[in-house]
């Protein structure tokens, strides 16, 4: 069997949801000593980067200029050390947002509910789209989908304090082209005092894996980075359409 290097990790810097005409940044974390990284889009070569000096850098950033629906889709990366190529990374789905119109998000029975109540979000967009997406702030990878002609509903069932937080919705014109985001709706779930004080609240910062962790080698960093790479390849997960 042909020998290959371990697959790199591909990430979007800050977010995989990129407003149209803005620049996206993807990171490919490979290995110290890699002389070339390649970014592939829908199976075709999109960009090349050759780090300098290769032995001091464990990954590269790829900038995707002027984001639009023709550059939204599935990206992957590979790297080379000498003549030996790595396996392909997992696929990363890059989405263009701020296309066309803005939906309206509402919640029933209201934004302030008690623990155990049934809650439903409604996302409405009058232009032609059939798929709607609901995202919770700080949980952008956990996308809920629903379908409808101009409105979709997202039944949450009986809520707990874990459902507290800010929500936005999008209309989707295809898997990779989304509308402007709705205005946020903040859901406040109150429980009894004991539950509320112990209930974990979701972080409002972006997902931790939506961050580039590229390093320059100094001393022990090479060993640490190798451990980090192996661990993250083992635990890394990403959303699928």
């Amino acid at each position: 069997p042909k020998q290959t290097l371990p697959k790199p990790i591909i990430r979007a810097e800050s977010t995989y949801m990129v407003p149209k005409e803005k620049q996206a940044t993807l990171c490919c974390q490979g290995s110290y000593g890699a002389v070339e990284y390649q970014l592939h889009f829908e199976g075709s070569l999109f960009a090349v980067e050759r780090p300098k000096p290769p032995e001091r850098i464990n990954g590269v950033k790829f900038h995707i200029p002027d984001m639009n629906s023709r550059k939204a889709g599935r990206y992957s990366c590979i790297y080379r050390v000498g003549e030996l190529w790595s396996e392909r990374s997992d696929l990363l789905d890059l989405v263009v947002t701020e296309m066309y119109d803005t939906p309206t998000l509402s919640v029933h029975p209201g934004p302030e509910v008690t623990s155990g109540e049934k809650v439903t979000f409604y996302c409405r967009l009058d232009t032609a789209t059939s798929m709607f997406l609901l995202l919770k702030e700080g949980r952008s990878r956990d996308v809920q989908r629903s379908y409808g002609k101009v409105q979709a509903e997202f039944p949450m069932g009986p809520v707990t304090t874990a459902h507290r937080g800010s929500y936005r919705c999008f209309g989707s014109y295809n898997n990779y082209a989304w509308s402007f985001p709705s205005e946020p709706v903040k859901l406040l779930v109150t429980g009894d005092i004991e539950n509320t004080s112990l209930a974990p609240t979701d972080p409002t910062f972006p997902d931790s894996w939506d961050t580039c962790l590229l390093t320059r080698e100094t001393g022990l960093q090479k060993d640490l980075a190798l451990w980090d790479h192996t661990a993250q390849n083992h635990h890394h997960h990403h959303h699928h359409h």
């Epitope: 075709s44 999109f46 090349v48 980067e49 050759r50 790829f62 995707i64 200029p65 002027d66």
Partner: nanobody, 127 residues
Framework: QVQLVESGGGLIQAGGSLRLSCVAS????????MGWFRQAPGLEREFVAG????????YSPDSVKGRFTISRDNAKNVLYLQMNSLKPDDTAVYYC????????????????????WGQGTQVTVSS
């Protein structure tokens, strides 16, 4: 946006050399990663060579590697493609393209990465 004008094409014997130029008007080319593509009749547009904003890094596919060399002169706002050992298969319209990018070092190989295109210059290699 940047206006791009190619020149240097023509009819050449197999084995000969040509140098294509691409001049950018108005905006400074230092803001752009650049590339050369070609399109033969009835075929898809094909990537031929790419160069980073700084000019430090270049990339070409195997089909032209060792024969075609891309370079740039940012002071003069010109992109070049030196084509040696030309073959009849190299006959095509050659286009230069520019991609406004934050990256000083990325090289783009995909048509969709490029926002600005020239009108093209015809290269015909006779046997």
């Amino acid at each position: 946006q940047v206006q791009l004008v190619e020149s240097g094409g023509g009819l050449i014997q197999a084995g000969g050399s040509l140098r294509l130029s691409c001049v950018a008007s108005e905006r400074s080319l230092t803001l752009y990663a650049m590339g050369w593509f070609r399109q033969a009749p009835g075929l898809e547009r094909e990537f031929v060579a790419g160069i980073s904003r700084t000019g430090d890094t270049t990339y070409s596919p195997d089909s032209v590697k060792g024969r075609f060399t891309i370079s740039r002169d940012n002071a003069k706002n010109v992109l070049y493609l030196q084509m040696n050992s030309l073959k009849p298969d190299d006959t095509a319209v050659y286009y230069c393209a520019a991609s406004a990018t934050y990256s000083a070092t990325n090289i783009y190989t995909h048509q969709r990465a490029y926002g600005d295109w020239g009108q093209g210059t015809q290269v015909t290699v006779s046997s």
